[in-house]
């Protein structure tokens, strides 16, 4: 048999909390235990379902868990059931609700005098109490002309006169919790003694030295007062009028007109209307001279033909707010098409090169008009006028690239040799219409250029091949004067260049021809044995036949080349004593002789008490000091060679003799005494 | 050679306006494009906008339209830039410069602009 | 207008080192296959010098020590190594579009 150990029972529960209707059953057999509500089988979910035998509730919700509740044991083998004892949920909850109008049926139908009855749609279980409020204050039962009835349900307000006026809301509580009205009722009732708002004024805008009208006019039983006032208080009557407002006109409608507004009228007039009872009312609005500031400039712009394209026009800052339009060539744009005005904005659609020109941004209002163009280019591809040419440049001469395009707008042109960018300096300039000049063409500018010339439409590019002529001219210049070592063999050498392989030959410059022993050997003057006759003038002469011929004048003089015949020698001195060292050279010019000494030149105008240069060339240096060591330098030169040898000088001190050392023993190194 | 002279230092007062002058050797302004470039003291540097001499045709930065004029003289080789209604922002050096294509290469020496009460 | 932004304002760098200057643009100064920002360099009393053209081509008797390099928005001036009469304004322009702008400027001194 089924046995069921726990029962569901019936208990209270909270709206939304938590709840268990308990079950546990035992039995001989397996069974399967389910539940049921109101006789059906409840559907698992997560806010209710089987906890074991147990059903479990997340949250209870008072509409969907009204009703029986029954626990159900089956032994699916034998086919027996028990149920168990019926249970139930005393739900406690409260829902908020609007405040409504229960009568009379409308609220136009509300006059004073009448009764007045507001229904507070608060529900729960158990019922809750009301508490009503008038514009946050809470109301008792009687109190002034009201009454709560139907258990504080409804509030009745009779008879309902101007006093009941006000925001009515509700609050209701029970043992479950609170709520309040969810929507609150505003009762509006008259009393005609009130002053009342038939027309009131709005804000004008006007322009300087126009009129302006404010209306403005109460009803009241009997008829209110109207009264204006200015920003500071003045009153305005058609009696007395502030000096600002001489020309202020108060009509008996109570309208007030201004004539010839100037920038002092601007500001907030206030509209006081008093009822026999009740407080004043006070309208404001407020007179705006009216005003258009200037319009910001405009760019240029560049757009490409097939594009589409907008330009904003931004209105200016004014009072009241511009009104904006674009027009073209004096005309209006209209509001569709493919150039047309949308908003503030010019569109172009597909724009085609005819579109360019001036299009005009006007903006208005009362204060005035203001405009701004801005002129659009329509960019298009550059065309040719000129492609560079490969071209002839003669060797130093200046030499011209062309590359002149044409399009919209400007192109801008740029060079590249050998696919490097060609930057504006002393040898290139790229003038504005895309020309390049080379200022000195020289053998290397021999190469490829090329030339972009580009618009935002695009770009075209052409190259050219420039070649260098060449100019007749010896490579290198032979040196003017030149000098041959007497009863030596000796070379002058002469080579040229130039567009085609020029002819090189020598000659004596006063015609007389080379002697036998000297040979022109391809541009190179040989001279088997140099005799004192060979010295003299010779040219040079390069020639082709397509650039003439060139010369070059040399001057060979011939000499016995510098020999040394005293050299100086490594030499040690006793520091106070006197260093002699001896230099003697021989050579045809007759060498000079030249003195360094420690890295500089001795000049024998400002050699100093202690040293002097002989005629013969040595060096003598008195009293020697310590500081004179070092390399000296004997150079000997003449117009047509030089030459120079070096040698030591060590200064030390004098050492002091030993006992052991006779008179006559010599000193340890080689010496200089004086 | 290339040069770019400019005319000589200026103390204007507020208000008052300047020419200033660049005048072009070694070169025919007519074959470029001549700058303005402003350069207050010890500040960088603003393109005030370009001249092309040959037809006159002008391009300005937009915070110059309207204050700086920029003409060229092809006869005498010479462009000129004028200030009008100087303010103390206009202290400043004004350089004029040349290019062919699109980089300033050749640059005058500049002129001193100083306005003071 | 295309702002360009120079960083940093100011470098000291050691004799034999390498200074590095960026200029950022608001956007790409690329066209026609070209980037056209330049760098110049001012000392004082003096008007700026081209130094670098195109963003990596080296202006007329520029030392090969100055290089630049980038393209779209992105551009560095490199010097190495630095000598002592390096020290001057480097400015970044942009030829793009007009109105051309300059960066603010970068004051490179010795370290």
């Known amino acids: 048999a089924i046995v069921f150990i726990k029962q569901p029972s019936s208990q209270d529960a909270l709206q939304g909390r938590r709840a268990l209707l308990r079950c546990e059953v035992e039995a001989p057999g397996p069974v399967h235990v389910y539940w049921l509500l109101d006789g059906a089988p409840v559907q698992d979910t997560e806010r209710r379902f089987a906890q074991g035998s147990s059903l479990s509730f997340a949250a209870v919700d008072r509409l969907q868990d009204s009703g029986t509740f029954q626990c159900v044991a089956r032994d699916d083998v034998t086919g027996e059931e028990a149920r168990s004892a019926n249970a139930s949920f005393n739900i406690k909850w409260i829902e908020a609700g609007p405040v409504v109008l229960k009568h009379p049926a409308s609220e136009a139908e509300i006059q004073p005098q009448t009764q007045v009855t507001l229904r507070c749609h608060i529900d729960g279980h158990p019922r809750p109490t009301y508490q009503w409020f008038r514009d946050g204050t809470p109301l008792s039962d009687g109190q002034s002309n009201h009454t709560v009835s139907s258990k504080e349900r409804n509030l009745t307000l009779r008879p309902a006169g101007p006093e009941h006026s006000g925001l009515y809301s509700c609050c209701a509580h029970s043992a479950f919790g609170q709520a309040c009205s969810s929507q609150n009722f505003t009762l509006s009732i008259a009393d005609e003694s009130f002053a009342r708002v038939v027309l009131a004024p709005q804000d004008v805008v006007v322009a300087r030295y126009e009129e302006a009208m404010f209306h403005c006019q109460f009803s009241a039983q009997p008829p209110p007062s109207l009264q204006w006032l200015f920003e500071d208080e003045t009153p305005i009557t058609n009696r007395s009028r502030p000096p600002h407002l001489r020309r202020a006109t108060v009509f008996a409608n109570g309208s007030l007109l201004l004539t010839q507004v100037r920038p002092r009228n601007a500001g907030i007039y206030r509209c006081i209307g008093q009822g026999q009872r009740g407080p004043p009312i006070i309208l404001e609005a407020t007179l705006h001279l009216a005003e258009i500031e200037d319009m910001p400039l405009f760019e240029p712009r560049v757009f490409t033909a097939g594009s589409e394209e907008r330009v904003t026009c931004l209105p200016p800052k004014g009072l009241p707010e511009p009104s904006v339009w674009w027009e073209h060539a004096g005309v209006r744009l209209p509001t569709h098409g493919r150039v047309y005005q949308k908003g503030h904005e010019l569109v172009l659609a597909n724009i085609a090169e005819s579109d360019a020109g001036v299009y005009t941004c006007h903006a208005a209002n009362l204060a005035g008009q203001r405009r701004q163009d801005v002129n659009i280019t329509v960019a298009t591809v550059p065309s040719w006028l000129k492609k560079p040419q490969d071209s002839q440049l003669e060797e130093g001469k200046p030499g011209y690239l062309d590359c002149l395009t044409q399009a919209t707008p400007k192109p801008t042109v740029v060079w590249y040799r050998n696919q490097m960018l060609i930057s504006e300096d002393s040898r290139f300039e790229v003038f504005k219409n895309g020309t390049l000049r080379i200022n000195s063409v020289e053998v290397y500018d021999g190469t490829w250029y090329r030339c972009m010339s580009s618009t935002p439409a695009g770009s075209i590019e052409a190259q050219a091949r420039v070649q260098v002529l060449e100019k007749l001219k010896f490579t290198p210049p032979p040196q003017p004067q030149q000098c041959m070592e007497f009863d030596k063999e000796a070379t002058v050498p002469c080579s040229a260049t130039g567009r085609e392989k020029p002819t090189i030959k020598w000659e004596r410059a006063d015609g007389s021809s080379l002697p036998e022993w000297v040979t022109d050997n391809a541009g190179t003057l040989h001279f088997a044995r140099v005799t004192r006759d060979d010295a003299g003038n010779y040219t040079c002469i390069a020639s082709n036949g397509p650039q003439g011929q060139i010369r070059a004048h040399v001057q060979l003089t011939v000499a016995v080349f510098i020999t040394f015949k005293v050299e100086p020698e490594r030499t040690t001195v006793y520091q106070g004593h006197t260093a002699l060292l001896q230099c003697e050279a021989q050579g045809d010019p007759k060498p000079l002789i030249q003195w360094k000494g420690k890295d500089r030149i001795l000049d024998p105008t400002k050699l100093g008490p202690r040293m002097h240069i002989f005629q013969n060339g040595s060096l003598v240096i008195h009293d020697v000091a310590p500081e004179d060591s070092g390399r000296y330098t004997c150079i000997a030169g003449n117009s047509c060679n030089i030459k120079h040898t070096e040698a030591p000088l060590y200064v030390v001190d004098k050492p002091v003799p030993e006992e052991s050392e006779g008179p006559g023993s010599p000193p340890p190194y080689k010496m200089i005494q004086t | 050679q290339v040069q770019l002279q400019q005319s000589g230092a200026e103390l204007m007062r507020p208000g008052a306006s300047v020419r200033l002058s660049c005048t072009a050797s070694g070169f025919d302004i007519k074959d470029y494009y001549l700058h303005w470039v402003k350069q207050r003291p010890d500040q960088g540097l603003e393109w005030i906008g370009r001249?092309?001499?040959?037809?006159?045709?002008?391009e300005y930065a937009p915070n110059f339209q309207g204050a700086a004029t920029m003409t060229a003289d092809t006869s005498s080789n010479t462009a000129y830039l004028h200030l009008n209604s100087l303010t103390s922002g206009d202290t400043a050096v004004y350089y004029c410069?040349?290019?062919?294509?699109?980089?300033?290469?050749?640059w005058g020496q500049g002129t001193l602009v100083t306005v003071s009460a | 207008d295309i702002v360009l932004t120079q960083s940093p304002a100011s470098l000291a760098v050691s004799l034999g080192q390498r200074a590095t200057i960026s200029c950022r643009a608001s956007e790409s100064v690329d066209n026609y296959g070209i980037s056209f920002m330049n760098w110049f360099q001012q000392k004082p009393g003096q008007p700026p010098k081209l130094l670098i053209y195109?963003?990596?081509n080296q202006g007329s008797g520029v030392p090969a020590r100055f290089s630049g390099s980038g393209s779209g928005t992105d551009f560095s001036l490199n010097i190495h190594p630095m000598e002592e009469d390096d020290t001057a304004m480097y400015f970044c322009?942009?030829?793009?579009?007009?109105?051309?702008?300059f960066g603010g400027g970068t004051k490179l001194e010795i370290k």
């Open positions: 195109a963003a990596s």
């Open positions: 410069s040349r290019t062919g294509t699109r980089w300033i290469a050749y």
């Open positions: 322009q942009q030829s793009k579009e007009v109105p051309w702008t």
């Open positions: 001249i092309d001499p040959e037809d006159g045709d002008t």
